[in-house]
Interface confidence: low
């Protein structure tokens, strides 16, 4: 590859907002490579050298009174101004989460498993995800990926519950997010739909068979008792 | 007190590549950047451009100042070059993966400098360019960089994917692999046995029950035809 030495200048003009725009802090920061060498902090009111490398700049810029006045006014002219312009599509942006629950491993019941609550596509990043088993909150055995930024103004997170699912148990993932007026819940039952339908089919078939058999025997023997001498010979003749 | 929101106007200039960037960041997401070649504002989400505007020419002026500052700082530092910091790379999907359901692979390239990187998506070992997209270099609080690359795809058990990242901090290209992890269905042995036995017993019961019902009914009819002895 290209092995020539590289030289990098970075500048960051930062606006930090507390309680809406009630308190605002403006920072004008200069970097050589990753090293910050000089900065203006609205809480200080003038440029300060962060390293020796920035001393000449701090001295020179602090001698320019017009520049200092401009930087001191930046909390209003720059920060609050930009906050107001972008507020509707940044601060007020709300995208509700898609929630999916699935077992991480396909294990039979009564085996250690990890239930995954996948929460996707939401904005902003502040979110609360809780696990419940049969209505009781589970606090132990809960592992999370933490908040993952997708880079497209959405977030995702996976919250896992280590558990040994037993038949009939109901697991619930509950999500609270600023986009939702009430918590969003998604249930997972310890038996799969296919397993449940197999059980139902089996039990249903068995019961139906017994009913038919019972009814047949009842009708057959009732008639046998009433007319013992009149049976025709042969089977289903 | 922790701040609620942070807006950062982030700029850089890199020599000898002569590459510059100007972007606005809100809480870690890009609002827009300025395309230096086209001299135009590029909004990260199309709808942002309907709510605000930015004059791209102003960014070009800033970048010119950054370039001048860099030349001063390079001399002042006695021509100390940057130390390459290699990226960490993660490949993930946009949402839970389902077979043949459109999804997006995300290649997250993080904690690196300088901001020059070559990223290639590979499907079964071959470069893919259809539908791919990427972000510009995004700033980090430690003044390293982040970047996202995206590949829309249709999940299949046949295909394997790699995000191939080249950076001067890496001895060789870094490949991060992704493939569809098909969940094997549960054995459901008990359920299968219950189902099979239940249906078998049920069927046998229905057949025998029906036979007995028919016999019983015929017997009853025969008795009625003959009358009392």
């Amino acid at each position: 590859g290209d092995t020539r030495p590289r030289f990098l200048e970075q500048v960051k003009h930062e606006c930090h907002f507390f309680n809406g725009t009630e308190r605002v802090r403006f920072l004008d920061r200069y970097f050589y490579h990753q090293e910050e060498y000089v900065r203006f902090d609205s809480d200080v009111g003038e440029y300060r050298a962060v390293t020796e490398l920035g001393r000449p700049d701090a001295e020179y810029w602090n001698s320019q009174k017009d520049l200092l006045e401009q930087k001191r006014a930046a909390v209003d002219t720059y920060c609050r101004h930009n906050y107001g312009v972008g507020e509707s599509f940044t601060v007020q942006r709300r995208v509700y989460p898609e929630v999916t629950v699935y077992p991480a491993k396909t294990q039979p019941l009564q085996h250690h498993n990890l239930l995954v609550c996948s929460v996707n596509g939401f904005y902003p990043g502040s979110i609360e995800v809780r696990w419940f088993r049969n209505g009781q909150e589970e606090k132990t055995g809960v592992v999370s990926t933490g908040l993952i930024q997708n880079g497209d103004w959405t977030f995702q997170t996976l919250v896992m519950l280590e558990t040994v699912p037993r038949s009939g148990e109901v697991y619930t993932c509950q999500v609270e997010h600023p986009s939702l007026t009430s918590p969003l819940t998604v249930e997972w039952r310890a038996r799969s739909e296919s397993a449940q339908s197999k059980m139902l089919s089996g039990v249903g078939g068995f019961v139906l068979g017994l009913l038919f058999l019972g009814a047949g025997l009842f009708i057959y023997f009732r008639n046998q008792k009433g007319h013992s001498g009149l049976q025709p010979t042969g089977f289903l003749s | 007190i922790k701040e609620e929101h942070v807006i950062i106007q982030a700029e850089f200039y890199l020599n000898p590549d002569q590459s510059g960037e100007f972007m606005f960041d809100f809480d870690g997401d890009e609002i827009f950047h300025v395309d230096m070649a086209k001299k135009e504002t590029v909004w990260r989400l199309e709808e942002f451009g309907r709510f605000a505007s930015f004059e791209a020419q102003g960014a070009l002026a800033n970048i010119a100042v950054d370039k001048a500052n860099l030349e001063i700082m390079t001399k002042r530092s006695n021509y100390t070059p940057i130390t390459n910091v290699p990226p960490e790379v993660t490949v993930l999907t946009n949402s839970p993966v389902e077979l043949r359901e459109p999804n997006v692979l995300i290649c997250f390239i993080d904690k690196f400098t300088p901001p020059v990187v070559n990223v290639t998506w590979l499907r079964n070992g071959k470069p893919v360019t259809t539908g791919v997209s990427e972000t510009v270099f995004l700033p980090r609080e430690d003044h390293l960089f982040r970047k996202f690359h995206y590949l829309p795809f249709l999940p299949s058990t046949e295909d394997v994917y790699d995000c191939r990242v080249e950076h001067w901090g890496l001895d060789e290209p870094l490949l991060k692999h992704w493939e569809f992890d098909a969940p094997s269905p549960l054995p459901e042995t008990t359920e299968n046995v219950v189902c099979a036995l239940g249906l078998t017993v049920g069927l046998v019961g229905i057949i025998i029950g029906t036979i007995f019902i028919i016999k019983g009914v015929r017997k009853s009819n025969a008795a009625e035809r003959r009358g009392p002895l």
């Epitope: - | 079964n124 071959k126 046949e158 394997v160 060789e172 290209p173």
Partner: antibody, heavy 120, light 109 residues
Framework: QVQLKESGPALVKPTQTLTLTCTFS??????????VGWIRQPPGKALEWLAL???????YYSTSLKTRLTISKDTSKNQVVLTMTNMDPVDTATYYC????????????WGQGTLVTVSS | DIVLTQPPSVSGAPGQRVTISCSGS????????VTWYQQLPGTAPKLLIY???QRPSGVPDRFSGSKSGTSASLAITGLQSEDEADYYC?????????FGGGTKLTVLG
């Protein structure tokens, strides 16, 4: 297990066209990410890569021999065919076919090789 | 076309450690993985090391590979008589596979 076997004429006259067939088993050339390549080795000399064909019929050739080489495959027969035109005595070599898992950039299984002599 | 440079020969006594170097450029070794093959007399080459430093199953851990920048090397420790063979490095250059000129390893004694 994976096996490859080269077949073709042992003797070729100058200016003639050489046709070599690689018959393989233990893998399929319809599997994503698999390629089959040809490599030759003149007596007492180094290995030289000639050509490669991918599962999806993409073909790659050595720059210096590109105009003389053609590679093709018959997936149903598990065969790869290499033709080399305008043979010359300097093309006398053992010709190997080998499998490549393409994302590796390596040849993991090789045939035993077939010696081709170019002489009038 | 020999694109990667290897020493024509190296030698060592049994039990010793030897290394074989392989030098390339930014577009091959610098940007891609390196593979090493062993070719015993009269046989086809055999895969020895792939992905710079990975051994296929069945290859003794006496063989190890490494890569730095545009060069790679193969190290053989505890040299044995059966290691006497030709060793080739190979990489990838855009859409082309490239080989080294080969190194003849002689086990002395």
């Amino acid at each position: 297990q994976v096996q490859l076997k080269e077949s073709g004429p042992a003797l070729v006259k100058p200016t003639q066209t050489l046709t070599l067939t690689c018959t393989f088993s233990g893998f399929s050339l319809s599997t994503s990410g698999v390629g089959v390549g040809w490599i030759r080795q003149p007596p007492g000399k180094a290995l030289e890569w000639l050509a490669l064909i991918d599962w999806d019929d993409d073909k790659y050739y050595s720059t210096s021999l590109k105009t003389r080489l053609t590679i093709s495959k018959d997936t149903s027969k598990n065969q790869v065919v290499l033709t080399m035109t305008n043979m010359d005595p300097v093309d006398t070599a053992t010709y190997y076919c080998a499998r490549s898992p393409r994302y590796r950039g390596a040849f993991d299984y090789w045939g035993q090789g077939t010696l081709v002599t170019v002489s009038s | 076309d020999i694109v990667l440079t290897q020493p024509p020969s190296v030698s060592g006594a049994p039990g010793q450690r030897v290394t074989i170097s392989c030098s390339g450029s930014d577009s091959n070794i610098g940007a891609n993985y390196v593979t090493w093959y062993q070719q015993l007399p009269g046989t086809a080459p055999k895969l020895l090391i792939y992905d710079n430093n990975q051994r296929p199953s069945g290859v003794p851990d006496r063989f190890s590979g490494s890569k730095s920048g545009t060069s790679a090397s193969l190290a053989i420790t505890g040299l044995q008589s059966e290691d006497e063979a030709d060793y080739y490095c190979q990489s990838y250059d855009y859409d082309h596979y490239v080989f080294g000129g080969g190194t003849k390893l002689t086990v002395l004694g």
